[in-house]
Interface confidence: medium
């Protein structure tokens, strides 16, 4: 895969992921009422980061915002912060990456500058994706904790739990926004990794200086330093190919093991 293609694909993947992070942040269905024990209910409750909603069996739906930070759990506010930081970093990453795209010429910007901008945007996308994944995971953990606590309360007859609007009768489980957030965070992360890989392809190869003649005793042979490299597969001609082969494997690894970040 060429540098331009990898960079462009990384940008598109990050853009899709970024859009998903915004969508997840705005969605109301971060937690939804668990209907396992009560599949036929007159009211279906679901909650987002910014408001909670009620949908009746008739289809009537109404939402109301969390007007203050007063009774909201610190974890929820932390998740809000992580998602917003992810969005802000994503916006900056997109702006930087637009200028860094190899297919777009801006003034006399050389490949070195574009490489630095590509790396910067890649890092921003990676951090943005990680913020989203952590934010969604923290919320999911909060839900799991509350779910089991409310399950215990059902059988012990205790009162409602704190956290989100948690009552003895109502338990909440994962909403669609969590899955959107996880996928979006992963895509943004992958896109960022691809941008970082593309940066390595954009970096001018300092070892490709002009050929110099070395005069050995009794012989007059010209050596091209890049020649040996090319024959071993490490020359400038095949550098991109080698790195992108590795890049493809990284992407596969990322999809197979979404919790491993040690190679980022």
């Amino acid at each position: 895969m060429s540098v331009t293609a990898c960079q462009g694909l990384g940008f598109v993947v990050s853009l899709i992921g970024f859009a998903g992070i915004i969508a997840a942040t705005c969605m109301d269905q971060w937690s939804t009422q668990d209907l396992y024990n009560n599949p036929v209910t007159a009211v279906f409750n679901y909650q987002g980061l910014w408001r909670s909603c009620v949908r009746e069996s008739s289809g009537f739906t109404e939402c109301r915002g969390y007007f203050t930070l007063l009774g909201l759990p610190a974890m929820l506010q932390a998740v809000r912060a992580l998602m917003i930081v992810g969005i802000v970093l994503g916006v900056i990453g997109i702006l930087v990456s637009i200028f860094a795209l190899k297919c777009i010429r801006i003034g006399s910007m050389d490949d070195s500058a574009k490489a630095k901008m590509t790396l910067t945007s890649g890092i921003l996308f990676i951090i943005s994706g990680i913020c989203a994944i952590i934010g969604v995971s923290v919320f999911a953990n909060m839900l799991v904790t509350n779910f089991w606590m409310s399950t215990a309360n059902m059988y012990s007859g205790m009162g409602g739990m704190g956290g989100m609007v948690q009552t003895v009768q109502t338990r909440y489980t994962f909403g669609a926004a969590l899955f959107v957030g996880w996928v979006a965070g992963g895509l943004t992360l992958i896109g960022g990794v691809m941008m970082c890989i593309a940066c390595r392809g954009l970096t001018p190869d300092d070892s490709n200086f002009k050929a110099v003649s070395y005069h050995a005793s009794g012989q007059n042979v010209a050596y091209r330093p890049g020649g040996f490299k090319a024959s071993t597969g490490f020359g400038s001609n095949t550098r991109n190919k080698k790195i992108y082969d590795g890049g493809a494997r990284t992407e596969d690894d990322e999809q197979s093991h979404p919790t491993k970040y040690d190679y980022v």
Epitope: V43, E56, F60, Y66, F67, G159, G160
Partner: antibody
């Protein structure tokens, strides 16, 4: 002008039943959740229960749960409260109240209209 | 279960500022009601700090930490009444015990 007029109060024997009505006018009744709130003589306000705008969901306070039923007839712009197994501690002025919302939020934070109340006395 | 806690009484001279607190609620939604003897309650503040039409500007609401406050600036004699805060405890609506505002 929003008007809520309660009726049906009076003296009831312990263990007896009563049905309160609330006639609403001056607003689109079918668009708002409605509540019943009571106040024992010389005491504070107590949330009895709430019904959504469509009548699809109802919630009740712990003191009346299992003994109270709130219903509404949107065609007649009327709210009802049926109370069974009445006790002396149910003696109070019962207010019909309008929420600013359409859904049942189990909340007493946004009641923007109240009736004048009807007194229910449970005594032998 | 949550409880809304209010001071039983607050006394203030005419023209001064009265502050009535309410603490212990849930999820940040509070309303304030004024009730004069023999009358039904009247909503004076909703959503912590919003004033319904027809309510004088001297009534305002604020929140700090886990406490909301009803502030009446330039108290007048007609403001003497019982004031209740309302909210919810995640399973039912609840009211504070009420605060009697006395204008000296």
């Amino acid at each position: 002008e929003v008007q809520l007029l309660e009726s049906g109060g009076g003296l009831v024997q312990p263990g007896g039943s009563l049905r309160l009505s609330c006639a609403a006018s001056g607003f689109t009744f079918r668009s708002y959740a409605m509540m019943w709130v009571r106040q024992a003589p010389g005491k504070g306000l107590e949330w009895v229960g709430e019904i959504s705008s469509t009548g699809g969901s109802t919630y009740y306070g712990s003191a009346v749960k299992g003994r109270a039923t709130i219903s509404r007839d949107n065609s007649k712009n009327t709210l009802y409260l049926q109370m069974n197994s009445l006790r002396a501690e149910d003696t109070a002025v019962y207010y019909c109240a309008k929420s600013t919302y359409g859904a049942t939020w189990k909340s007493a934070d946004s009641i923007d209209a109240w009736g004048q109340g009807t007194l229910v006395t449970v005594s032998s | 279960s949550y409880e809304l806690t209010q001071p039983p009484s607050v006394s203030v001279s005419p023209g001064q500022t009265a502050r009535i607190t309410c603490s212990g609620g849930y999820n940040g939604h509070y309303g304030w009601y004024q009730q004069k003897p023999g009358q039904a309650p009247v909503l004076v503040i909703y959503s912590n700090n919003q004033r319904p039409s027809g309510i004088p500007e001297r009534f305002s609401g604020s929140s700090s930490g886990t406490t909301v406050t009803l502030t009446i600036s330039g108290v007048q004699a007609e403001d003497e009444a019982d004031y209740y805060c309302g909210g919810y405890d995640s399973s039912a609506g609840i009211f504070g015990g009420g605060t009697k505002l006395t204008v000296l």
